[in-house]
């Protein structure tokens, strides 16, 4: 099996304010073993958007049911965009690990930029 | 140009056999799924069969399971479509396409070849 | 197998209308999975939508794709003269990937 790659095929989304954004992301392989979790920035700073593992996030939704057998898209709709959810969005694979889960590819990252509400 | 060309359509008698090439230039071939789509004359499009970037696995249709194989050579960038025990039902122009992504089966086929024809008949 | 069923199997309509396509899957799908094309006769089929929403490279914004679960839209807002041909949606990720039967739109 080809070693894992972490697909993010737009590098920009547009979205008007108010409405729904989709943000794509989807593993070439189900090897290794672990979560998937999506972040806006990068490096320390970064802010978690969506746990695959835990949490509560109420405005993410996933695109395909995560739980199926040989899932591989891990896209996210996130509802009710405003300007302060402008940025760009990494989508980063973990490998399952003791105690914790470790960091082990990330997508090339989608920058979303909101639009005004059309009047 | 990014670019898929196919070959080796041609007339063949009920249950004989064809092996259809198609040739990729322009992306890195070997990184992406391709796949074999086929139109019967008159009517709509008929996914046949697909095949995982490394060639690791492969997809069929029921309808052609048993009787067709896919498979790649990535080192020649081509794709190939081995089709056996042919029938007059195989009628039909066959294209390659190129998965959009490198996820195999992921969003859709963004490339395709012009097609080649093959007609099956006595 | 999940079943792809598109109606109407033709559209007549004058350029300028706004054309509305319809995609029903037997049985509920990701929206990942789902693409439309288009074919001109005598040419390969061209990717317009994926993802069931996002236009395709080049794709002109007059074409939009919207629905989830089992019925998915494909709007073309005001047709121009180069868009009469006949459309497709498609079930990926599976194995069958299956095509619709298609919806040809045609000049009134």
């Known amino acids: 099996e080809d070693e894992l790659q972490v697909i993010q095929p737009e590098k920009s989304v547009s979205v008007a304010a108010g409405e729904s954004a989709t943000l794509r992301c989807a593993m070439t392989s189900l090897i290794p073993v672990g979560p998937i979790m999506w972040f806006r920035g990068a490096g320390a700073g970064r802010e978690l958007i969506y746990n695959q593992k835990e949490g509560h996030f109420p405005r993410v939704t996933t695109v395909s049911e995560l739980t199926k057998r040989n899932n591989l898209d891990f896209s996210i709709s996130i509802s009710n965009i405003t300007p302060a959810d402008a940025g760009t969005y990494y989508c980063v694979k973990f490998r399952k690990g003791s105690p914790d889960d470790v960091e082990f590819k990330s997508g090339a990252g989608t920058e979303l930029s909101v639009r005004a509400k059309p009047s | 140009q990014v670019q898929l060309v196919e070959s080796g359509g041609g007339v063949v008698q009920p249950g004989g056999s064809l092996r259809l090439s198609c040739a990729a230039s322009?992306?890195?071939?070997?990184?992406?799924?391709m796949n074999w789509v086929r139109q019967a004359p008159g009517k709509g499009l008929e996914w046949v069969s697909a095949?995982?970037?490394?060639?690791?696995?492969?997809y069929y249709a029921d309808s052609v399971k048993g009787r067709f194989t896919i498979s790649r050579d990535n080192s020649k960038n081509t794709l190939y479509l081995q089709m056996n025990s042919l029938r007059a039902e195989d009628t039909a122009v066959y294209y390659c396409a190129k998965d959009f992504t490198e996820v195999v089966g992921w969003l859709g086929m963004d490339v395709w070849g012009q097609g080649t024809t093959v007609t099956v008949s006595s | 197998e999940i079943v792809m069923t598109q109606s109407p199997g033709t559209l007549s309509l004058s350029p300028g209308e706004r054309a509305t396509l319809s995609c029903r899957a037997s049985?509920?799908?990701?929206?990942?999975?789902l693409a439309w094309y288009q074919q001109k006769p005598g040419q390969a089929p061209r990717l317009l939508i994926y993802g069931a929403s996002s236009r395709a490279t080049g794709i002109p914004d007059r074409f939009s794709g919207s629905g989830s679960g089992t019925d998915f839209t494909l709007t073309i807002s005001r047709l121009e003269p180069e868009d009469f041909a006949v459309y497709y949606c498609?079930?990926?990720?599976?194995?069958?990937?299956?095509f619709g039967g298609g919806t040809k739109v045609e000049i009134k």
């Open positions: 498609q079930l990926l990720g599976s194995s069958p990937r299956t």
């Open positions: 322009g992306f890195t071939f070997s990184a992406y799924g």
């Open positions: 095949i995982r970037a490394s060639g690791g696995a492969t």
């Open positions: 049985q509920s799908v990701s929206s990942s999975y």
